[in-house]
């Protein structure tokens, strides 16, 4: 029997300060350039070394950004989302959704880290 892949979805508020290397990440997605099928959301595609996001450590590639400084990113064209970030100012508050893949083994299988009961 094969294992099943589940996802643990969590949300987090991340406050970043635009430093000398900027916020330091790239995005994909938007209503005109969907990154995920049937989802026009904005996703983190790259985190740059020495940028504010990398130094903070919480934002991850693949995270979905739900809002910037309280402004919802739903149903935005890609460029409009980019402009929102670029005009967000020095202190930037991000509401993000992390999607962690959880591998469940076959029924009856005890993983190495499981307590022996």
């Amino acid at each position: 029997m094969n294992g099943r892949v589940d996802y643990l979805v969590t949300e987090e508020e991340i406050n970043l300060t635009r430093g000398p290397s900027g916020l330091g990440f790239n995005i994909v997605g938007g209503t005109d350039q969907q990154y995920v099928s049937n989802d026009s959301g904005i996703y983190v595609s790259r985190i740059k070394e020495n940028g504010a996001a990398a130094l903070d450590g919480r934002l991850q590639e693949g995270d979905k950004i739900l809002s910037v400084n309280g402004q919802d990113l739903k149903n935005l064209l890609h460029q409009d989302a980019v402009d929102l970030f670029r005009n967000a100012g020095y202190a930037v508050s991000l509401r993000v959704q992390h999607r962690l893949q959880v591998q469940n083994g076959p029924i009856g299988h005890r993983g190495e880290g499981d307590p022996s009961g």
Epitope: R18, S21, G22, L23, G24, F25, N26, I27, V28, D32, Q33, Y35, S45, R46, K48, G51, L77, H78, Q79, V82, F85, R86
Partner: nanobody, 127 residues
Framework: HVQLVESGGGLVQAGGSLRLSCAAS????????MAWFRQSPGKERELVAD????????YYRDSVKGRFTISRDNAKNTVYLQMNGLKPEDTAVYYC?????????????????????WGQGTQVTVS
């Protein structure tokens, strides 16, 4: 395999014009924009102009504003750089580049690392 091929470079007198072209071939990519960079001897490669693939947004570095125009033809997978009023300081190798995402930072933070695919370059010399 994605390929970007530049053409249109050459030798021109100050005040003259050139039109650079960059043709993209290979697998269809969900590109977010294409750009022209330039590099002169002993200097870092610098972003000259960028156009979003949707065409709704363009950027120009200050020194070329009003003289250079970037445009794209999605049907032909080609990006152009029309360069008018050329100056000797525009002399450089010009590179076409494509990006598969967008930086969230203002343009002064954007650089070589934000672009994923590169052409081989075409020489522009202004005498």
């Amino acid at each position: 395999h994605v390929q970007l091929v530049e053409s249109g470079g050459g030798l021109v007198q100050a005040g003259g014009s050139l039109r650079l072209s960059c043709a993209a071939s290979g697998p269809s990519m969900n590109w977010y924009g294409m750009a022209w960079f330039r590099q002169s001897p002993g200097k870092e490669r610098e972003l000259v102009a960028d156009v979003s693939w949707s065409g709704g947004s363009t950027y120009y570095r200050d020194s070329v504003k009003g003289r250079f125009t970037i445009s794209r033809d999605n049907a032909k997978n080609t990006v152009y750089l029309q360069m008018n009023g050329l100056k000797p300081e525009d002399t450089a190798v010009y590179y076409c580049a494509a990006r598969t995402s967008s930086s969230v930072d203002p343009w002064n933070y954007v650089g070589v690392g934000d672009y994923d695919y590169w052409g081989q370059g075409t020489q522009v010399t202004v005498s």
